[in-house]
């Protein structure tokens, strides 16, 4: 097989015919050294998935449920290209499965037992698989057959296509459970009508159903959505209140050696030449031979799936939970309202050791999961492999964009006992130089810079945001002659000053000696001209406070702060000489785990927090000899957020705006994936 050939998998005679036509038409418009199409015919989508995994084919387009099958071992396929619907300006690649109720009813998601339910149809995504999968562990046992358990959970339902003889309650609201539009309550509009008519109390539909059926906003305002956190939101807020986000139709390929760039090149060219309204002789999104062949007829084009987005992230935690529950039929032994152990995400082995020690001391209430970078940890929390971690504000922003929520803030200045209920204003992001140098904020060009890590607040977002507004481009590696900004491209000049050791050189974790606040300051001490850190960094690492060989003889007066007005001040004056105020680090979690994480952490800090005085013979949560492992070492307590419980409210408008502006220069693959 030539390496430029994409072997497309077809699942019927009609698809094979269209595939051959696709192949021939692409040949006529692409250069001979460009991508080409070959067609492989299989009996089913599952056979196609197996063929791709076995390297007998390269690509196939699948519905969400099959994307799940494709991702499971041993297939290990990943999404590479998404079909989009709607307009090019506002492309829709996902829909949201929602639970719609009337505004004048008063129950929540956890109070659905005994209500009447309206479904689009048996076995359908939004109408059955997702809601029943998410409710699975609340269904009465035995949960098999599933239809019987559902019939015993609701007090009456309309489930089109269900067996009305065996499960009459499922057809109580639509006698016969007709499986076509002859049943007035069939499909999306039907399920909504079932709610609207008062037959049912809740309808499980798509987010767009309510807009398609009620053009008038006043009418829509009579309805609300049930959210998974047992609150309600308006029907407009489906992005923040849904059961799951479901990808519509997706091209999958092998995770390793999957030709994803070639597949994208092919499909991008295909949509240019044969997309909507492009050509008379061949149309990608329709066919005389049948409906939805190779691609959905309703598709308007393709979008490349960001490389960081694996199948878990693409399908989303809620969707995978629902489908896994339905497929595997397993439920935790503990009642669902009881908090299970919290899985903390630790960065590399230093944090893992501290986390293990915490786990032992917590009697197993804390468990540990590891990842090599902060972004990998955030991804693990998103997909349920981990539950929580404490993050710098820059990563609180990324985590927030990825659907996580802040749970508790690290406080640094408030003495106990008021600490837990105090909202601090934040810390100062500062630029530190050696007293002996003649540097100012205005003559940093060409100098050697030291950063905590790319994407972090004091070390990157604030100084680079200010720099961007001065130089109007993102080539920061050209502005400084060299530097250490862990997380930069390995061949960048901003990795040149990093110390490693070798395989970990410039990695954004503690294996890189110049990572974090202490690391960036060490970089300044040993190699750099300026370090971008928090205002407490110099005092915390001078005067013998850091016993490490490189720091034990350092004096505070040998360092100064750069002020934005071009002057310099003592490190004792950060309030009058800083780059910006930074939001405190905060613990983040998935919404569904936030309450448990908060309760457990408040309990843990009472045992292992700053009230413990002897950390040499007791476990201390906020101590790691200046290494800031799991939490900043200067944390006094973890504090409740009260109403600052979203990433926007927690970080504040000004900081969010600054980071959003810097997104033009974003090097965050995770952020790109989460905003897809």
């Amino acid at each position: 097989v030539p390496e430029k050939s994409v072997r497309w998998c077809a699942v019927s005679e009609h698809e094979a015919t269209k595939c051959q036509s696709f192949r021939d038409h692409m040949k006529s418009v692409l250069p001979s050294n460009g991508p080409s199409v070959a067609c492989v015919k299989k009996a089913s989508h599952l056979d196609c998935i197996r063929a791709i995994a076995a390297n007998e084919a390269d690509a196939v387009t699948l519905d969400a449920g099959l994307v799940y099958d494709a991702y499971l071992a041993p297939n290990n396929l990943k999404p590479v290209v998404a079909e989009f619907y709607g307009s090019k300006e506002d492309p829709q690649t996902f829909y949201y499965a929602v639970a719609v109720v009337k505004k004048d009813s008063d129950f929540q998601m956890n109070q659905l037992r005994g209500r009447k339910s309206c479904h689009t149809g048996l076995g359908r995504s939004a109408g059955w698989n997702i809601p029943i999968g998410l409710l699975y562990c609340d269904l009465p046992e035995p949960r098999k057959p599933l239809e019987k358990a559902v019939a015993n959970f609701f007090s009456g339902s309309c489930v089109p296509c269900a067996d009305g003889t065996d499960f009459p309650q499922l057809c109580q609201l639509c006698p016969g459970c007709g499986c076509s539009t002859l049943n007035q309550y069939f499909s999306y509009s039907g399920a909504f009508k079932c709610l609207k008519d008062g037959a049912g109390d809740v309808a499980f539909v798509k987010h767009s159903t309510i807009f398609e059926n009620l053009a008038n906003k006043a009418d829509r305002d009579q309805y609300e959505l049930l959210c998974l956190d047992n609150t309600r939101k308006s029907v407009d807020e489906y992005k923040d209140c849904h059961l799951a986000r479901v990808p519509s139709h997706t091209v999958v390929a092998r995770s390793v050696g999957g030709k994803e760039d070639l597949i994208w090149e092919l499909l991008n060219q295909a949509q240019e030449h044969f997309g909507k309204d492009k050509s008379k002789e061949f149309q990608l999104f329709s066919s005389p031979h049948g409906k939805d062949l190779l691609f959905k007829d309703s598709a308007h084009g393709f979008l490349k799936v960001p490389p960081r987005m694996d199948a878990k992230m693409y399908l989303g935690y809620e969707y995978i939970t629902a489908i896994r529950n339905l497929r595997e039929g397993t439920c935790p032994e503990a009642p669902t309202d009881e908090c299970k152990p919290v899985k903390w995400c630790a960065l590399s082995h230093h944090e893992r050791l501290k986390c293990d020690e915490w786990s032992v001391n917590s009697a197993g209430k804390i468990e540990c999961e590891s990842a090599e970078t902060t972004e990998d940890c955030i991804a693990k929390i998103m997909n349920g492999e981990a539950d929580a971690m404490s993050l710098d504000g820059g990563f609180v922003y990324i985590a927030g964009m990825c659907g996580l929520v802040p749970v508790l803030a690290e406080n640094y200045n408030t003495p106990n006992p008021n600490c837990e209920n105090t909202a601090e204003e934040g810390y100062f992001a500062v630029a530190v130089v050696k007293s002996s140098s003649d540097l100012t904020w205005d003559n940093l060009k060409g100098k050697k810079s030291c950063h905590t890590a790319v994407g972090r607040t004091a070390g990157w977002n604030i100084p680079m945001g200010l720099l961007y507004s001065k130089i109007n481009h993102c080539r920061f590696d050209e502005f400084f002659s060299e530097g250490c900004a862990p997380g930069s491209e390995k061949n960048s000049s901003l990795c040149k000053l990093c110390m490693g050791p070798s395989p970990n050189l410039c990695e954004p974790n503690n294996k890189e000696g110049y990572y974090g606040y202490t690391g960036a300051f060490r970089c300044l001490v040993e190699k750099g001209d300026v370090a971008f850190v928090k205002h407490q960094t110099v005092p915390q690492n001078t005067g013998g406070k850091n016993p490490d060989a490189w720091a034990k003889n350092l004096k505070e007066e040998d360092y100064e702060l750069l002020c934005l007005d071009g002057s310099r001040k003592s490190v004792q004056e950060p309030a009058n000489c800083h780059l910006a105020r930074a939001p405190n680090h905060a613990v983040v979690a998935r919404k569904d785990k936030a309450d448990c994480v908060q309760t457990l952490l408040l309990d843990q800090q009472r045992m292992f927090g700053s009230s413990v005085t002897d950390c040499s013979s007791n476990f201390c949560l906020f101590e790691s000899k200046t290494k800031d492992l799991l939490f900043r070492d200067d944390t006094v307590c973890l504090a409740k957020l009260h109403d600052r419980n979203t990433y926007e409210k927690y970080l504040g408008e000004e900081y969010v705006k600054a980071v959003t502006n810097l997104r033009k220069c974003s090097t965050s693959p995770l952020l790109e994936a989460c905003t897809f």
Epitope: H350, E357, S617
Partner: nanobody
Framework: EVQLVECGGGLVQPGGSLRLSCAAS????????MAWYRQAPGKQRELVAG???????NYRDSVKGRFTISRDNAKNTMYLQMNSLKPEDTAVYYC???????????WGQGTQVTVSS
Amino acid sequence: EVQLVECGGGLVQPGGSLRLSCAASGSIFSIATMAWYRQAPGKQRELVAGITRSGSTNYRDSVKGRFTISRDNAKNTMYLQMNSLKPEDTAVYYCTDYSSRYYHDYWGQGTQVTVSS
């Protein structure tokens, strides 16, 4: 800094038992937490069991009910009693006192445990 030496490993049949010891060169009385880790070929090192200064213990799920961790502060020694051993328990076992956790990645030689028929 306390130096730790592990011993007691060996070859044992499935279902058999072994007792590992971890001897400290200095006093372990004031050490907050001690633990046993293991590393199988090609796998990450993983926490097996831990014990706090007050004697409360914690185990990874796969060894609960089979392994028992204990410490004797007077003898400056920690133990791991391993019963009903399985082939998947085969690994090099290491002890740690966590005291050097923030400075370097120090591990002793470990002791090899092989469970095979």
